[in-house]
């Protein structure tokens, strides 16, 4: 039976995808065939074949970026070390180990789901703009995050969430494969408005909130809070 595992990695980091036999196992590298591939597209990630040092079948996306340890394999550890994780690596990987002495029967089969994440930048909320006498427009921008974010606007006076019908979110997939988001909020003009923009990264369980205040043209920036309804000291910046 195939074992199933999950692992999380930050974009740009290195990650280990685990595929190992119980401790105390010993293997002869002239006997085992090890094959790592992606589960859906069957892209070849890396492999070990006895008396074969060339990895000519490895997909170019993984060449020199995916390695198994020969010393580890002797101990039954066929884990994959994947370097410089990218958003495109978010998929399921399958490790299959066969033994020639056992007639090429399956020794080990593991499917590892890799979840990739990247921190969004601290949101930037533009100063309010008045397209008409009775309307105010705010723009919130945050870039280079993963996966796709959720955006909330908050009434900072009572920490309530504003109706999502008032906002228009545009999410772009940038050249690095990361997400940039621009949210435009349109609300009725009132004498004093104290609002916040919150960017939520569900995978990292992280919310970045920045406030903007109208009335006396005061702008409040760089407030990063644990969730959309928490408050903090002015000018405090904290990661959740």
């Amino acid at each position: 039976d195939t074992q199933e595992k999950e692992v999380r990695a930050m974009v740009g980091s290195d990650v280990e995808l685990s595929c190992a036999c119980p401790e105390g196992s010993r293997f002869d590298l002239n006997d085992v065939y090890v094959y790592w591939q992606t589960s859906e597209s069957k892209t070849v990630v890396t492999y070990h074949i006895p008396q074969n040092s060339s990895l000519e079948n490895v997909d170019s996306r993984y060449r020199n970026r995916a390695l198994m340890s020969p010393a580890g394999m002797l101990r039954g550890d066929f884990s994959l070390r994947l370097f410089n994780v990218t958003p495109q690596d978010e998929q399921k990987f399958h490790c299959l180990v066969l033994s020639q002495s056992l007639g090429f029967q399956e020794v080990l089969s593991v499917e590892v789901t890799l979840h990739v994440a990247a921190n969004f930048s601290v949101p930037v909320v533009s100063a309010p703009h008045s397209p008409s006498q009775d309307e105010l427009t705010f723009t919130c921008t945050s870039i280079n995050g993963y996966p796709r974010p959720n955006v909330y606007w908050i009434n900072k006076t009572d920490n309530s969430l504003l109706d999502q019908a008032l906002q228009n979110d545009t999410v772009f997939l940038n050249m690095r494969g990361l997400y940039d988001v621009v949210s435009v909020l349109r609300i009725a003009r009132t004498p004093s408005v104290n609002i916040g923009c919150c960017i939520e990264n569900v995978l990292l369980q992280q919310n970045l909130t920045v406030g903007s205040q109208t009335g006396n043209d005061i702008g409040e920036r760089d407030k990063i809070t644990e969730n959309p309804v928490s408050t903090g000291e002015k000018n405090a910046a904290t990661w959740s």
Epitope: Y35, N57, L98, F104
Partner: nanobody, 117 residues
Framework: EVQLVESGGGLVQAGGSLRLSCALS??????????MGWYRQAPGKQRELVAA???????QYLDSVKGRFTISRDNAKNTVYLQMNSLTPEDTAVYYC?????????SGQGTQVTVSS
């Protein structure tokens, strides 16, 4: 029940050629979506993986057959082939096709290949 039926073996002189076929039948299993291999077993020796075609399309060969053997498939016929050229007496064995990994309950009778010098 999945069945693999090999054919195309025979007696051939050294330097000759043979083309082995393996038809997959039974429940809905597709050659296209399955990693398949050609194996061989000579008397008194352990089974060898001669040629492998992984489900992603990458192909690997035993060093001693590289440049001489070619594995291919016909998805429409649900059949996998092994074209064997420049045969030598060392290639004498029973040839089996099976999945990767080997599944004993899929195994056919194999097809005998004998190369005389």
């Amino acid at each position: 029940e999945v069945q693999l039926v090999e054919s195309g073996g025979g007696l051939v002189q050294a330097g000759g050629s043979l083309r082995l076929s393996c038809a997959l039948s039974g429940r809905a299993v597709s050659i296209a979506a399955t990693a398949m291999g050609w194996y061989r077993q000579a008397p008194g020796k352990q089974r060898e993986l001669v040629a492998a075609r992984w489900s992603g399309g990458s192909i690997q060969y035993l060093d001693s057959v590289k440049g001489r053997f070619t594995i291919s498939r016909d998805n429409a016929k649900n059949t996998v082939y092994l074209q064997m050229n420049s045969l030598t007496p060392e290639d004498t064995a029973v040839y089996y096709c099976n999945t990767l990994p080997w599944r004993a309950n899929y195994s056919g009778q194999g097809t005998q290949v004998t190369v005389s010098s």
